[in-house]
């Protein structure tokens, strides 16, 4: 069995379109190397949204490119995720790595169902 | 045991605040008219929202000042609550009463968790 | 594609030296721990070595222990073992595989021999 | 050099049922997870069942895993031509601090 990951079970994007969800981990060692992937589920599909390896020391870095941003302190990973729309509406799952030292570890948590809302159009100013 | 009540498990309000969904009832005889209560559960706690009594042949009125309309076709009644703010995110739960001709009959479905989120205020037009 | 290819493995004499390559490509190679692991012929596999994404920070067996250094160098997508000492019993084939174990090289063959 | 035990070689017959078993002690796969690695000839190992117990990406439903005290089970149903390899098992063991790996299994496809 693996590595017991928590995160919430409901989500509600802003009407920007962010979404923000604590991942956290139980970890029985200490992880000097963490990788954090956020995973789309739909049906038996899983894509990767984006994914970060951070040290426990330094700060959370995901790609320039990436729509995800994160903090971590911990075992606790302060995931958020922009530029979302109604169609993006759906399970996102937190996987954790414990990379380095060894022993490698893996956890996947049971997913965060995050609802966006399209924002009506705001009127044209004359 | 209660006559079986079917709705949604969840809904997503508009981003202007407006929440539809489907309460379905299950009915052995035919029912001339027929009470809908719409109640909102936070905690042990129930409130009414809103509530119509309608005759299968006419169309489901609610009051006036109700924040509710609805339309009804045979054992469905498609309810819409207007004005939602975020704070009035919760569990709405759908209450159906055959009022008559007898015998009476009252159901509850499990209820419709409903997530609102408030708009973005538009900037000013200069 | 995720491939790794293991280079450098030769014939070499007892107390000689080589240096293994791992050359990476498809992933992200700077975000990733590595690992390498051998297989001596008709043995099981041992693992020896690892070193975190950033190369900061290794860890290795006893038996290799002041003979052999990991390293990597990210900006060329590359993973290194450094083999000074060598002894008859490092005869193996040399893998090296991401640390989540989910991508291995084809391995490269040191033979150790007089 | 090899810490988890399991038997040299097995073998079945096409569509038939095979398990490879693999001990260890309370300080590894009593304590741990159990990963499991196909090797074909001539070629690296690649990743069977993940330490979580699950299968990798891409490997089929036929490939399952079992645990009870300090011995893992590899199960291959529906035996294919395909599926003829070596198989190594490997733990974390907690006293050694270190990766540890059976001697690996050599899968015969009976004609």
């Known amino acids: 069995k693996g590595m017991h990951v928590a995160q919430p079970a409901v989500v509600l994007a802003s009407s920007r379109g962010v979404a923000s969800f604590v991942c956290e981990y139980g970890s029985s060692g200490n992880a000097a190397e963490v990788r954090v992937t956020v995973l789309r589920q739909a049906g038996s599909q899983m894509t990767e949204v984006c994914a970060a390896t951070y040290t426990v020391e330094d700060e959370l870095a995901f790609l320039d490119d990436s729509t995800c941003t994160g903090t971590s302190s911990g075992n606790k990973v302060n995931l958020t995720i922009q530029g979302l729309r109604a169609m993006d509406t759906g399970l996102y799952i937190c996987k954790v790595e414990l990379m380095y030292p060894p022993p490698y570890y893996v956890g996947m948590g049971n997913g965060t169902q995050i609802y966006v809302i399209d924002p009506e159009p705001c009127p044209d100013s004359d | 045991k209660g006559m079986h009540v079917a709705q949604p498990a969840v809904v997503l309000a508009s981003s202007r605040g407006v929440a539809s969904f489907v309460c379905e009832y299950g009915s052995s005889g035919n029912a001339a008219e027929v009470r809908v209560t719409v109640l909102r559960q936070a905690g042990s706690q129930m409130t009414e929202v809103c509530a119509a009594t309608y005759t299968v042949e006419d169309e489901l009125a609610f009051l006036d000042d109700s924040t509710c309309t609805g339309t009804s076709s045979g054992n469905k009644v498609n309810l819409t609550i207007q004005g939602l703010r975020a704070m009035d995110t919760g569990l709405y739960i759908c209450k159906v009463e055959l009022m008559y001709p007898p015998p009476y009959y009252v159901g509850m479905g499990n209820g419709t968790q409903i997530y609102v989120i408030d708009p973005e205020p538009c900037p000013d037009s200069d | 594609e995720v491939q790794l290819v293991e280079s450098g493995g030769d014939l070499v004499k007892p107390a000689g030296s080589l240096r293994l390559s791992c050359v990476a490509s498809?992933?992200?190679?700077?975000?990733?721990?590595m690992n390498w692991v051998r297989q001596a012929p008709g043995k099981g596999l041992q693992w020896i070595a690892g070193i975190n994404s950033g190369g900061s920070s290794t860890s290795h067996i006893d038996a290799i222990k002041g003979r052999f250094t990991i390293s990597r160098d990210n900006a060329k997508n590359t993973l290194y073992l450094q083999m000074n000492s060598l002894r008859a019993e490092d005869t193996a084939v040399y893998y090296c595989?991401?640390?989540?174990?989910?991508?291995w090289g084809q391995g490269t063959l040191v033979t150790v021999s007089s | 050099q090899a810490v988890l035990n399991q038997p040299a070689s097995v073998s079945g017959s096409l569509g038939q049922r095979v398990t490879i078993s693999c001990t260890g002690s309370s300080s590894d796969i009593g304590k741990s997870y159990v990963a499991w690695y196909q090797q074909l000839p001539g070629t690296g190992p690649r990743t069977l069942i993940n330490v979580d117990g699950n299968r990798a990406s891409g490997v089929p439903d036929r490939f399952s895993v079992s645990r009870s005290g300090n011995t893992a089970t590899l199960t291959i149903s529906g035996l294919q031509a395909e599926d003829e390899a070596d198989y190594h098992c490997?733990?974390?063991?907690?006293?050694?601090?270190?990766?540890?790996f059976g001697s690996g299994t050599q899968l015969t496809i009976l004609g």
């Open positions: 498809g992933f992200s190679f700077s975000s990733y721990a």
């Open positions: 595989a991401i640390s989540n174990w989910a991508y």
């Open positions: 490997s733990s974390w063991d907690w006293s050694l601090h270190t990766y540890v």
